[in-house]
Amino acid sequence: ECVTQLLKDTCFEGGDITTVFTPSAKYCQVVCTYHPRCLLFTFTAESPSEDPTRWFTCVLKDSVTETLPRVNRTAAISGYSFKQCSHQISACNKDIYVDLDMKGINYNSSVAKSAQECQERCTDDVHCHFFTYATRQFPSLEHRNICLLKHTQTGTPTRITKLDKVVSGFSLKSCALSNLACIRDIFPNTVFADSNIDSVMAPDAFVCGRICTHHPGCLFFTFFSQEWPKESQRNLCLLKTSESGLPSTRIKKSKALSGFSLQSCRHSIPVFCHSSFYHDTDFLGEELDIVAAKSHEACQKLCTNAVRCQFFTYTPAQASCNEGKGKCYLKLSSNGSPTKILHGRGGISGYTLRLCKMDNECTTKIKPRIVGGTASVRGEWPWQVTLHTTSPTQRHLCGGSIIGNQWILTAAHCFYGVESPKILRVYSGILNQSEIKEDTSFFGVQEIIIHDQYKMAESGYDIALLKLETTVNYTDSQRPICLPSKGDRNVIYTDCWVTGWGYRKLRDKIQNTLQKAKIPLVTNEECQKRYRGHKITHKMICAGYREGGKDACKGDSGGPLSCKHNEVWHLVGITSWGEGCAQRERPGVYTNVVEYVDWILEKTQAV
């Protein structure tokens, strides 16, 4: 059962796993959610009735029954982890804590103009977990405007104390706001010979890499495959760090793989969600339950629905035993990973999908692309919406993309002459316009947010957000697309598609079925040559064939230019403008979404 509200002046008795320090009860709940075993917590707020050494303690708790006895205690705030909830969760914490000193290892001290600059410095420093900044009102003259970057083994402070005229906060790496280089390569036959901060068992290098990414101290890793000569080290995932943040020594060794934490590109890839099945593989761990199941998929579902289950092993039924049902072993461990991995016993193993909601929804698998043909199939582009106006009569106005459960990203030029959001309707999960009838459900628009620098499509800033009146429940036919990460600015996208119900030629009509076209990106320099009379800025991106023939057209405006990278779809562009449609040497011009990520986050995360 999902319980989101916090219980004031209440303490959960027993079940302690560990104690950490957090600046608020809200953040304690997040820490509990991300901890592999925590289901409940008790936080102690600052209070004259409470011993100051206990202020800001966050006690993480577990319970077989998923609850614990409640005791009244002033200044205690208790609650449940979000593991039990189905909604999207995030470790991103932009809060600034006034008059709090978050203690850790102070490894870097420098002068900064503001707390924001200090936070940016922390976000762009590979080791930094949190910071404390002494404001210009700080009593000690030589410490004023000093920005202290800090780290700890756990990523949370070792203590928190009250201190006047300082502010503290966390790195925004988990908000995808780091400018640190994103290094995606996995190096085969390579061992990084740096200090190990931890080791876990993993079925492959990809899972090892994901574990490294969400481990607070891990910067790179080495994984020993199941063919590694030393039997005791097979499937071992070594989590590593170094002073420089980079591996100091690389040793060539067969059957080992190494790679980097993806903390600076984490919103582009699933980090917590290990969705693969591992055949002829047994995961060992503490047994939670043994249940009969028809298949390994059914076993994974059972594990996902059991809040304490972290991973499972399924043993298929022998011949006609037990109505063809096999045994599903639901398991857990102290760190969320198997304690040992065995091969050759015939089991099929995998992980809970409960943690998938800790990743951005947009990274989860969607239907495979349909090759050939121009008409889309249902569920192929689940982020695409059709935006209708009801005035003077109802009609398709523009395309748009779901980027959050209450947010549509589209083009600003779509709203020329639109006086009020009341006349707008957003339809999602639509393949054919003919499906839209009087009684078809839609999302009303609460607010239209147009970029304040927008004047006309051709001069840029052609971007707008629609805040919906109600939230979108994600399904296979309606789900968000990922925004490109700032860390991916230099990715060269090769698999890009434009979609929409727009005209198929310049003088045409709105199409019934959602159309798609694969279109190559064109460099801005090449694009500028084709549009001598316009300024193609870095905030625009162009796509099209030199010979023409495939392009967006009237009615596609506001829709997505979607590019697949590392198995994840990104909203690279918003259909904006062009000369004619699909003309030779006249590429389509799109709003370059990566340049507006900060603007989008600022508008969608504003309180």
């Epitope: 762009d124 280089a181 994103c182 290094i183 390569d185 420089s244 980079l246 020594t249 690389r250």
Partner: nanobody
């Protein structure tokens, strides 16, 4: 003692090409970030391109994407910047820099070692 030495600068017409080289002594490019930066008179130094030598991951400023290519020759401990379709606004002193930590690749403030620079002039 660490030394980075740039070469290959010169004068060229708009649309032309140049190839800059950066050779290191006392510092190995292997396992490190190497960046090319430029500074025009009266302007701040800006990142142009960078490479992480271990895997060859590359990073480019938007203004040079598709025109400039950074590459490496680990055996020669040399990093190159191939500059094509040059424009007058590319005129600047180009510097090679080496980092010893994991950095934002185009942020000049985070690089430790610097060369003396080589002048590139593009005329229209």
């Amino acid at each position: 003692q660490v030394q980075l030495q740039e070469s290959g600068g010169g004068s060229v017409q708009a649309g032309g090409s140049l190839r800059l080289s950066c050779v290191a002594s006392g510092y190995t490019f292997n396992n490190n970030f190497v960046g090319w930066f430029r500074q025009a008179p009266g302007k701040e130094r800006e990142g142009v391109a960078a490479i992480y030598s271990l895997g060859g991951s590359t990073y480019y400023a938007d203004s040079v994407k598709g025109r400039f290519t950074i590459s490496q020759d680990n055996a020669k401990n040399t990093v190159y910047l191939q500059m094509d379709s040059l424009k007058p606004e590319d005129t600047a002193t180009y510097y090679c820099a080496g980092a010893i930590t994991w950095v934002p690749p185009l942020s000049h403030r985070r690089y430790t070692y610097w060369g003396q620079g080589t002048q590139v002039t593009v005329s229209s």
